[in-house]
């Protein structure tokens, strides 16, 4: 499991008495997302490394729907709209936590799961390996 | 809460009998991260919209450490290394689920929380609103 820093009343996750199964309230609290006026909504189109969003659905997972980014080009889009293949569009990936039903189909028992998702794309200079 | 699609044995979260509090096993299962040979490790430096990574720590949250991206420039880096301010470096943001201790300091009781994190940056063409 992920280590939780030692805190009064919160034993470290490495301790043998740290709870491996906990109670989780599923009434989600939106901490700071609702106050943000400009989300990344149209960046996928305006980026020099544009991407498409694909719906990944799994009823055994919570949340069941995750959107995955897939870069549109191998290269990056120039000001004139053409693709520059001397640069690379690459996905920015992030590990996120989801809840996986365990045992399967069980309505109130889950296991934490770490999955890697592509959030968007960025344009990078390629690594060029020079032969000696 | 997030709606979980109707499934045999899994009532919809809108149903009054859907469990608002569930059991979660904290032994994290790494689903597909170990098989990924190229993580975004050096993209933050090689991107035309480079970013720095900052450690966001909160002992009341699970995971307690989240890395946040912050773009280095308002503009984007050109091939010659100078910054082009006619383009914009913008953070790619994603809503993620975390567990928040509730009540505070309680070792085995959590609430699901949605937070918005910046994962990396991308270079976009600015929106220009033309006055009629």
């Amino acid at each position: 499991g992920i280590a939780i820093p030692r805190n009064s009343g919160c034993p470290n996750s490495e301790d043998k008495n740290f709870p491996r199964t906990v109670m989780v309230n599923l009434n989600i609290h939106n901490r700071n997302t609702s106050t943000n006026p400009k989300r990344s909504s149209d960046y996928y189109n305006r980026s020099t490394s544009p991407w498409n969003l694909h719906r990944n659905e799994d009823p055994e997972r919570y949340p069941s729907v995750i959107w995955e980014a897939k870069c549109r080009h191998l290269g990056c889009v120039k000001a004139d709209g053409n693709v520059d293949y001397h640069m690379n569009s690459v996905p920015i990936q992030q590990e996120i936590l989801v809840l996986r039903r365990e045992p399967r189909h069980c309505p109130n028992s889950f296991r934490l799961e770490k999955i890697l998702v592509s959030v968007g794309c960025t344009c990078v200079t390629p690594i060029v390996h020079h032969v000696a | 809460g997030i709606a979980i699609p109707r499934n045999s044995g899994c009532p919809n979260s809108e149903d009054k009998n859907f469990p608002r509090t569930v059991m979660v096993n904290l032994n994290i299962h790494n689903r597909n991260t170990s098989t990924n040979p190229k993580r975004s490790s050096d993209y933050y430096n090689r991107s035309t919209s480079p970013w720095n990574l900052h450690r966001n720590e909160d002992p009341e949250r699970y995971p307690s450490v989240i890395w946040e991206a912050k773009c280095r420039h308002l503009g984007c880096v050109k091939a010659d290394g100078n910054v082009d301010y006619h383009m914009n470096s913008v953070p790619i943001q994603q809503e993620i689920l975390v567990l928040r201790r509730e009540p505070r300091h309680c070792p085995n009781s959590f609430r699901l929380e949605k937070i918005l994190v910046s994962v990396g940056c991308t270079c976009v063409t600015p929106i220009v609103h033309h006055v009629a």
């Epitope: 901490r31 700071n32 609702s34 106050t35 943000n36 006026p37 400009k38 | 970013w51 720095n52 900052h54 966001n56 909160d58 946040e68 991206a69 912050k70 773009c71 280095r72 420039h73 308002l74 503009g75 910054v83 301010y85 006619h86 470096s89 913008v90 953070p91 943001q93 937070i115 918005l116 994190v117 910046s118 940056c121 600015p126 929106i127 220009v128 609103h129 033309h130 006055v131």
Partner: antibody
Framework: EVQLVESGGGLVQPGGSLTLSCAAS?????????MCWVRQAPGKGLEWIGC????????YYASWAKGRFTISRDNSKNTVYLQMNSLRAEDTAVYYC??????????????????WGPGTLVTVSS | DIQMTQSPSSLSASVGDRVTITCQAS??????LSWYQQKPGKAPKLLIY???TLTSGVPSRFSGSGSGTDFTLTISSLQPEDFATYYC??????????????FGGGTKLTVL
């Protein structure tokens, strides 16, 4: 409700110090918000003092404010502070706390301030 | 530091008029400019950011244009609630030591 409330204003003697607080509610500092301080002398225009990134603690100041004014934050209390030293009569003003409109990871507070507190009056006089 | 020069400093107009306020930066700030409206005894209200992007909830009669050093705020048809003081603000930075967040001197818009 999303709001900012300043406190700590009042009468202070020239040469004295004062610390203003700005308590945020309805949103969390967890992550990157730019929180700024702006002042307005009676009958005058707006004057930017500085900003702090609540995520990494980076501060930005107007050239005239460097050295005498310090901005800090306590994310656990959702509060930003403005410490003012060596106060002068010309520092008399309404001090506003404000939040930059863009959340999360922008290089600088570059999107204007969309949320303001009502302001707190600081009077420097003997 | 970048200086922001706003003109005119005061302006009288009537309901229904088209009003233009200009703001000039002492050096290029690209499109990193915001406009605010302030009424007596109240905190400023953000109208426009990034030179031309209207803040949510602001009426479409307000518009902004310009880039580099010259910027304009236009109110296409003045309404009674628009009489106030307007400020421009630069929001440009290249490093923490050269971040410029400067307000213009303000334009007081009064009833003719």
């Amino acid at each position: 409700e999303v709001q900012l409330v300043e406190s700590g204003g009042g009468l202070v003697q020239p040469g004295g110090s004062l610390t203003l607080s700005c308590a945020a509610s309805g949103f969390s500092f967890s992550g990157f918000y730019y929180m700024c301080w702006v002042r307005q002398a009676p009958g005058k225009g707006l004057e930017w003092i500085g900003c702090i990134d609540t995520g990494d603690g980076t501060t930005y100041y107007a050239s005239w404010a460097k050295g005498r004014f310090t901005i800090s934050r306590d994310n656990s209390k959702n509060t930003v502070y403005l410490q003012m030293n060596s106060l002068r009569a010309e520092d008399t003003a309404v001090y506003y706390c404000a939040r930059d409109a863009a959340y999360g990871g922008y290089a600088y507070p570059a999107h204007g301030m969309d949320l303001w507190g009502p302001g707190t009056l600081v009077t420097v006089s003997s | 530091d970048i200086q922001m020069t706003q003109s005119p400093s005061s302006l009288s107009a009537s309901v229904g008029d088209r009003v233009t306020i200009t703001c000039q930066a002492s050096e290029s700030i690209y499109r990193y400019l915001s406009w605010y409206q302030q009424k007596p005894g109240k905190a400023p209200k953000l109208l426009i950011y990034l030179a031309s992007t209207l803040t949510s909830g602001v009426p479409s009669r307000f518009s902004g244009s310009g880039s580099g050093t010259d910027f304009t705020l236009t109110i296409s048809s003045l309404q009674p609630e628009d009489f106030a003081t307007y400020y421009c603000q630069s929001n440009f930075g290249t490093a923490s030591t050269t971040y410029y967040n400067t307000f213009g001197g303000g334009t007081k818009l009064t009833v003719l």
